[in-house]
Interface confidence: medium
C-alpha cells in the first residue's frame, strides 16, 4: 500500500493538510513530541503560582514547578500547595503543629508517628521532636560484654503523603 506522507514529518513539525500534507514547523507556543503528527499541541503555560522549570520547545512541552512558598502536587506538577514549616502539616484550617508522638521533617506532607524502637528490641537513644524522628539505640543485648558492634539506627521510613485540600483554592 501507499505510505502515509505524514509519516515522514519529524517531531517539531506537523503534517499540514491545507498545504498538500507537507511538513510545517510547529507555530510559536506549540510543539509535537513525535513524528507523523497532524497537529501540534499547545505549550503548557506556567502562570500564577506555577513557574517555568523548562521552557517549551518545538519538540517538548514546558515543565512547571511552583513559586516560592509552594510545592508541587500531582503528576507533572498539576497543582501547587502551600509550604508549611517542618514540624507541621497542612490541614483545611492551615498549617498545624504535629501532635505529640508525630513528626514531619519536610515543608510538605503529613506528620508521621515516631519510630517505635521497642518493636525492634532497641532503646531510644535520642528523643523525637515535632521536626525529627526518634533515634533508636542499640538493644540491651548489643551492649552486653563481648558484643562486637553496635547496630546502626533503623533507616527512616519513606515519607507518606496525603495532600489536604485548601478551602478557596
Amino acid at each position: 500500500g501507499l505510505q502515509d506522507p505524514c509519516s515522514n514529518c519529524p517531531a517539531g513539525t506537523f503534517c499540514d493538510n491545507n498545504r498538500n500534507q507537507i511538513c510545517s514547523p510547529c507555530p510559536p507556543n506549540s510543539f509535537s513530541s513525535a513524528g507523523g503528527q497532524r497537529t501540534c499541541d499547545i505549550c503548557r503555560q506556567c502562570k500564577g503560582v506555577f513557574r517555568t522549570r523548562k521552557e517549551c520547545s518545538s519538540t517538548s512541552n514546558a515543565e512547571c514547578d511552583c513559586t516560592p512558598g509552594f510545592h508541587c502536587l500531582g503528576a507533572g506538577c498539576s497543582m501547587c500547595e502551600q509550604d508549611c514549616k517542618q514540624g507541621q502539616e497542612l490541614t483545611k484550617k492551615g498549617c498545624k503543629d504535629c501532635c505529640f508522638g508525630t513528626f514531619n521533617d519536610q515543608k510538605r506532607g503529613i506528620c508521621r508517628p515516631w519510630t517505635n524502637c521497642s518493636l525492634d528490641g532497641k532503646s531510644v537513644l535520642v528523643n523525637g521532636t515535632k521536626e525529627r524522628d526518634v533515634v533508636c539505640g542499640p538493644s540491651p543485648a548489643d551492649l552486653s560484654p563481648g558484643a562486637s558492634s553496635v547496630t546502626p539506627p533503623a533507616p527512616a521510613r519513606e515519607p507518606g503523603h496525603s495532600p489536604q485540600d485548601i478551602e478557596g483554592r
Epitope: 506556567c46 502562570k47 503560582v49 513559586t67 516560592p68 515543608k107 485548601i166 478551602e167
Partner: antibody
C-alpha cells in the same frame, strides 16, 4: 470590598521594636497570603516578608534576624514586628494581599509612615 | 539576591504616546515577573503578573512581555492618569525583589 489598613505608632525610638498591624476585610484569609513591603522616603520598594494562609512565613534574609510576621485570624489582623530599629528603617510600610492562585500583590493597604528618631 | 534593573529611570512623554519600560533580571527568572504602578502618596497597584497577564480591571493599553532576563512593560497610548512611577518585581526566588522604578512624567 477588599480593604487592608495598616496601623501603628508613627514614631519609634532607635533600638526599640517597631510594631504594626494590618487589618483586612472583604476576603477570606484562607485563600490569601499577606506580604509586608516598605518604601523609604523618595526611594524604591523593599520586600520584608510574607505569611501564607497556612501560617508559614518567609522573610527577606537582610531583615530575617529582626522581623516577625504573625496573624490573628479571629481579628482578621496581621502583625509586623521589627526589632532593634535604626534611622535606616524609616519608611512607609505597606501590607498587601497575595492570592494563592497567582504570585502577585493584587491589593495593597494605603501605607503608614514610621519614623525612627530619638 | 536577584537584582532587577529598570531603564530608563525616568522619561517624559505626551498623552497618546507609546511608552516602553524595560526591566532586566540579574539571572533567569522565567516569566515570574509582575509590574506595579504607583502614584505620589499612594500605594502601588498591580498591573501585570506572570510577565504578560493583566490583573483584573487593568486597561488593555497596558501590556507586558518577556521571559528569562529581559522584560518589557508597554503603554500603547499614554493617558493623563498613567503619569506615575512603574516598578517591576521578580518572584522566581526569595527574597522577592523590585526594580528601582521608572518615573513617567508629562512632557
Amino acid at each position: 470590598q477588599v480593604q487592608l489598613q495598616e496601623s501603628g505608632p508613627g514614631l519609634v525610638k532607635p533600638s526599640e521594636t517597631l510594631s504594626l498591624t494590618c487589618t483586612v476585610s472583604g476576603f477570606s484569609l484562607i485563600s490569601y497570603g499577606v506580604h509586608w513591603i516598605r518604601q523609604p522616603p523618595g526611594k524604591g520598594l523593599e520586600w520584608i516578608g510574607v505569611i501564607w494562609s497556612g501560617g508559614s512565613t518567609d522573610y527577606n534574609p537582610s531583615l530575617k534576624s529582626r522581623v516577625t510576621i504573625s496573624v490573628d485570624t479571629s481579628k482578621n489582623q496581621f502583625s509586623l514586628k521589627l526589632s532593634s530599629v535604626t534611622a535606616a528603617d524609616t519608611a512607609v510600610y505597606y501590607c498587601a494581599r497575595n492570592p494563592l492562585t497567582a504570585t502577585v500583590m493584587d491589593y495593597w493597604g494605603q501605607g503608614t509612615l514610621v519614623t525612627v528618631s530619638s | 539576591d536577584i537584582q532587577m534593573t529598570q531603564s530608563p529611570s525616568s522619561l517624559s512623554a505626551s498623552v497618546g504616546d507609546r511608552v516602553t519600560i524595560t526591566c532586566r533580571a540579574s539571572q533567569n527568572v522565567g516569566t515570574n515577573v509582575a509590574w506595579y504602578q504607583q502614584k505620589p502618596g499612594k500605594a502601588p497597584k498591580a498591573l501585570i503578573y506572570s510577565a504578560s497577564y493583566r490583573d483584573s480591571g487593568v486597561p488593555s493599553r497596558f501590556s507586558g512581555s518577556g521571559s528569562g532576563t529581559d522584560f518589557t512593560l508597554t503603554i500603547s497610548s499614554l493617558q493623563p492618569e498613567d503619569f506615575a512611577t512603574y516598578y517591576c518585581q521578580q518572584y522566581n526566588s526569595y527574597p522577592l525583589t523590585f526594580g528601582g522604578g521608572t518615573k513617567v512624567e508629562i512632557k
